[in-house]
């Protein structure tokens, strides 16, 4: 899972340059070959033209090249010239294709140079998966924005279904990509590429710029800015996971720069189950089973206008803030109200972003990110 410190291996710029130059040389080689063949055919055609009607004899002989003293029947000569013209035109087409390929390769080379020149601007694009101990005050890196991701989508001849599929076709740079899960319109997602594959970011909070206290329809469809804070949308997440089990990674950060990374094996239901989240395996990390309701328990999603929580006496989303998989209202809520400073009143404080077993029930977190990665189809329950 994403709780490891080893980095994915990225191709070095040297390797990329070797590949790029190799492609350029291949293009040039093809071009030279086409030019050579074309000039040979042109020479041959000139010789035949010069020979003209003077060349007669050896009927039916099509051996090339022809000796000037050969005697060729005019009809055979005409037939040969027609064949040569056809061949020449095919070579011409090949030449144009090669030239086109050459231009394309030169563009690719320029693009690599452009990327290379901007490479220095990028920070590391993989999750730092080591769980941070509070004493180490380790900072969790922000989601890196793409400079110009080298999209590998063309290999699929369609849009990728999710970030994991993008990873499988060779994409190694994190950033914004268009995906199109089966039966869904295309949409833009933040992909985090790690040594474990591609993860789709489904939630991000870091500055309080987006209001998360929204109704059911908003949580279903999604809201916010993929470049900033957002909730991807339950329907979009479900279209990514389908009926498969998934890994859910949760990154938390407090106001001192301490970070925690948790991972769960989950199953997300469709709207008919109120997008119930079921834990299908124990929690990975150091926070123990108290982090969330017991494994196997299915918790529906709730908002202030659609109360599906497990409390009969209370609407968790209404008394707290935002939409969440509320069990008893007190375990966690990463879609709560964003506080830049700790409010004095406890009543207000309980509405914040919290994860009880990490920094406590009344500690409003500074930043959170949720990522999902569907498992292979056979893993589905």
């Amino acid at each position: 899972g994403p709780v490891q410190s080893k980095s994915p291996r990225f191709a070095s710029w040297d390797e990329m340059n070797v590949l790029a130059h190799g492609l350029l040389q291949l293009g040039q080689g093809l071009r030279e070959h086409a030019e050579r063949t074309r000039s040979q055919l042109s020479a041959l055609e000139r010789r035949l033209s010069a020979c003209g009607s003077a060349c007669q004899g050896t009927e039916g002989s099509t051996d090339l090249p022809l000796a000037p003293e050969s005697r060729v029947d005019p009809e055979v000569l005409h037939s040969l010239q027609t064949q040569l013209k056809a061949q020449n035109s095919r070579i011409q087409q090949l030449f144009h294709k090669v030239a086109q390929q050459q231009r394309h390769l030169e563009k690719q080379h320029l693009r690599i140079q452009h990327l290379q020149s901007q490479f220095g601007l990028l920070d590391h694009k993989h999750l730092d998966h080591e769980v941070a101990k509070p004493a180490r005050r380790k900072r969790l890196p922000e989601m890196a924005q793409p400079v110009d991701p080298a999209h590998n989508v063309s290999r699929l001849h369609r849009l990728p279904r999710d970030c994991q599929e993008l990873f499988q076709v060779g994409e190694r740079q994190s950033g914004l990509f268009e995906i199109q899960p089966q039966g869904s319109p295309p949409f833009l997602v933040n992909c985090k590429m790690t040594s474990d594959g591609g993860w789709t970011v489904i939630q991000r909070r870091h500055d309080g710029s987006v209001d998360f206290n929204r109704p059911w329809e908003a949580y279903k469809a999604g809201f916010g800015d993929p470049h900033g804070e957002f909730w991807l949308g339950l329907e979009k997440v479900h279209s990514i996971t389908g009926d498969r089990n998934s890994r859910l990674a949760v990154q938390l950060r407090d106001w001192d720069g301490n970070a925690e990374l948790l991972q769960f094996s989950v199953h997300l239901g469709g709207e008919d189950t109120a997008y119930s989240l079921q834990l299908t395996a124990p929690v990975a990390g150091q926070l123990g089973a108290t982090t969330v309701p017991p494994s196997g328990l299915s918790v529906p999603f709730s908002t202030w206008d659609q109360d599906h929580d497990l409390r009969r006496d209370k609407n968790c989303a209404k008394s707290l803030s935002g939409g969440w998989w509320f069990g008893t209202c007190s375990h966690s809520n990463l879609n709560g109200q964003y506080f830049r400073s700790i409010p004095q009143q406890r009543q207000k404080l309980k509405k914040g972003i919290f994860w009880k077993t990490w920094r406590g029930r009344y500690y409003p977190l500074q930043a959170t990110t949720m990522l999902i990665q569907p498992m292979a189809a056979e893993a589905a329950s």
Epitope: D148, P149, H151, G175, E178, L188, A218, F223, D225, P226
Partner: antibody, heavy 120, light 107 residues
């Protein structure tokens, strides 16, 4: 501040292809959708289509058979080609940045527009 | 495609008056409705996104409301510089579509 600038011929002959380019400055072209929108004189706005920086496109079904869009991230620009034009394609053509938002995308920056007249 | 119907087509208003423009969608679009202002010989400018959120730098006299199929743009205390055509736009489903526009003239 993001700025968009359309360029291309102001006069196109019927049955020919209209070609426009939009140069983006002030921000990278990456991570956004880029749209073309047109407006015939005295009329409303019509969305032509959009392109993402990966080159993936979506066109308005009403124009789909005649539209081609492309993007050049190294030059921070994107282009529109509209084939087999008629007088009905005479309009002011705008390029616009379509800001992705999970609550529904919107056009936050527009070019100043370029008038294209189709006439022989 | 989703059809947006704006009303009225034209409004002549005196300064300081309140202006209300409505936009009706042919099917529910949640809050994926945005409003633009276009002054003569200028390109459109975003005023309101997601039915009710003001875009940065837009004067507070402009406000939006509604969800589903019925939306309203309100200009409280109209100023001379507000003379323009106002368009609604939906991005709930592709293709993007715009309302026919409402021209606001200062009396």
């Amino acid at each position: 501040q993001v700025q968009l600038q359309e360029s291309g011929p102001g006069l196109v002959k019927p049955s020919e292809t209209l070609s426009l380019t939009c140069i983006v400055s002030g921000d990278s072209i990456s991570g956004y959708y880029w749209s073309w929108i047109r407006q015939p004189a005295g009329k409303g706005l019509e969305w032509i289509g959009r392109i993402y920086t990966s080159g993936n496109t979506i066109y308005n079904p009403s124009l789909k058979s005649r539209v081609t869009m492309s993007v050049d991230t190294s030059k921070n620009q994107f282009s529109l080609k509209l084939s087999s034009v008629t007088a009905a394609d005479t309009a002011v053509y705008y390029c616009a940045r379509e800001r992705p938002d999970y609550g529904g995308n919107f056009f936050d920056y527009w070019g100043q527009g370029t008038l294209v007249t189709v006439s022989s | 495609e989703i059809v947006l119907t704006q009303s009225p087509d034209f409004q002549s208003v005196t300064p300081k008056e309140k202006v209300t423009i409505t936009c009706r969608a042919s099917q529910s679009i949640g809050s994926s409705l945005h409003w633009y202002q276009q002054k003569p010989d200028q390109s459109p400018k975003l005023l309101i996104k997601h039915a009710s959120q003001s875009f940065s730098g837009v004067p507070s006299r402009f406000s939006g409301s509604g969800s589903g199929t019925d939306f309203t743009l309100t200009i409280n205390s109209l100023e001379a510089e507000d003379a323009a055509t106002y368009y609604c736009h939906q991005s709930s489903s592709l293709p993007h579509t715009f309302g026919g526009g409402t021209k606001v003239e200062i009396k």
